[in-house]
């Protein structure tokens, strides 16, 4: 079988065998090696010499196999825009950012550029849980039956109503979507405003 050509090698049809790791150089009509992630082209290829790569300097990176003559500058996450760093920049990957807790991404340009505060969910509702953090503003949904939530908050969850009998007490007032059950000692009389509702 034919030995596989090693870059640089001639290419008549302007395509290279390994599209990820090689590129077509039109001046010499050859296929040359790309530089691996974390490196850049320090010397271009010729008919007799393959690409020479060098490591990206500190605070710069290249994420992919490339034939770039420079590395990209690392950019910090912009905390003024509500972003926080979740992984620092390395020679092979740019800084990874996301919105801080309590914020959502309000502006995208290939990646999130600006986060804003999540809106509050009013009493009787809670924020619908999303799979991914920081991806959208709160969508408030009513507490399900038997649950309540009594604050205006972006993060408060509906809680189950207290079961008075579990505490050896009796119900004085039923819970609502916005308030918990009121319990009382079984020996205490009902407050005057509720005495009319008692079955004798």
């Amino acid at each position: 079988s034919q030995p596989q050509a090693v870059p640089p090698y001639a290419s008549e049809n302007q395509t290279c065998r390994d599209q990820e790791k090689e590129y077509y150089e039109p001046q010499h009509r050859i296929c040359c090696s790309r530089c691996p992630p974390g490196t850049y082209v320090s010397a271009k290829c010729s008919r007799i010499r393959d690409t020479v790569c060098a490591t990206c300097a500190e605070n710069s990176y290249n994420e992919h196999w490339n034939y770039l003559t420079i590395c990209q500058l690392c950019r910090p996450c912009d905390p003024v825009m509500g972003l926080e760093e979740i992984a620092p920049c390395t020679s092979k990957r740019k800084t990874q950012c996301r919105c801080q807790p309590g914020m959502f991404c309000a502006a995208w340009a290939l990646e999130c550029t600006h986060c804003e505060l999540l809106s509050d969910c009013p009493p009787g509702t809670e924020a619908e849980l999303k799979d991914e953090v920081g991806k959208g503003n709160n969508h408030c949904v009513p507490c399900k039956a038997g649950h309540f939530q009594n604050t205006s908050s972006p993060s408060a969850r509906c809680q189950p109503h207290t079961r008075c009998e579990n505490q050896g007490l009796v119900e004085a007032a039923p819970g609502t979507a916005q308030s918990d059950t009121t319990c009382k000692n079984p020996l205490e009389p009902l407050p005057p405003e509720m005495s009319g509702t008692m079955l004798m």
């Epitope: 905390p79 003024v80 509500g82 926080e84 801080q100 309590g102 953090v133």
Partner: antibody
């Protein structure tokens, strides 16, 4: 160098309260969310909650209504007010930088016992 | 909440051994996983973030791999100072969760 220094722990009776502090240096504190984590004796790590740069808070269910996180960005200080303490709250309490908890303080010990 | 299951819970090994600790998430967490080392009486120290990126100053004998739900911490050649407890932690969710820990002891 990022440094976090917790203080305010101690021995407290069940039902009692403490205010834990975390003094931050070496980074722009006001820009970062901050996290509290605790570790009961001989046990694993438990996330307590996170506070964002503007003071918005998220808590784990077991401490909701009893613990309150706050911060003073002008003093580069984070606080955890712990109320209605129970025996099971006995632990070393750590503050950590960012919601990812990338750098931790040395911890402060809270012992709840009668 | 996302559950993190770490195994083994304890491990005896000798200096020079290659050691592997695994961590499984109850749902996909992309590469939002850190590994921490904790020595008795000390705070946890982050060794690895984003599943495989080494913190600066951490020896290259430590490595991490995995994505999605299954992750691995490997120590290629154990040194005396590596005997400690190791924890995985997910940060895909703001409510961080930790594995139960792996206590690495001298055989």
């Amino acid at each position: 160098e990022v440094q976090l220094l917790e203080s305010g722990g101690g021995l407290v009776q069940p039902g009692g309260s403490l205010r834990l502090s975390c003094a931050a240096s070496g980074f722009t504190f006001s820009y970062y969310a901050m996290t509290w984590v605790r570790q009961a004796p001989g046990k694993g790590l438990e996330w307590i909650g996170v506070i964002n740069s503007g003071g918005g808070t998220y808590y784990t269910d077991s401490v909701k209504g009893r613990f309150t996180m706050s911060r003073d960005n002008s003093k580069n200080t984070l606080y955890l007010q712990v109320n209605s303490l129970r025996a099971e709250d006995t632990a070393v309490y750590y503050c950590a930088k960012a919601s990812t908890a990338d750098v931790w303080g040395q911890g402060t010990t809270v012992t709840v016992s009668s | 909440d996302i559950q993190m299951t770490q195994s083994p819970s304890s491990l005896s090994a000798s200096v020079g051994d290659r050691v592997t600790i695994t961590c499984q998430a109850s749902q996909g967490i992309s590469n939002y996983l850190s590994w921490y080392q904790q020595k008795p009486g000390k705070a946890p120290k982050r060794l690895i973030f984003a599943a495989s990126s080494l913190e600066s100053g951490v020896p290259s004998r430590f490595s991490g791999s995995g994505s999605g739900t299954d992750f691995t911490l490997t120590i290629s050649s154990l040194q005396p100072e590596d005997f400690a407890t190791y924890y995985c932690q997910q940060y895909n969710s703001y409510s961080l969760t930790f594995g139960g820990g792996t206590k690495l002891e001298i055989k």
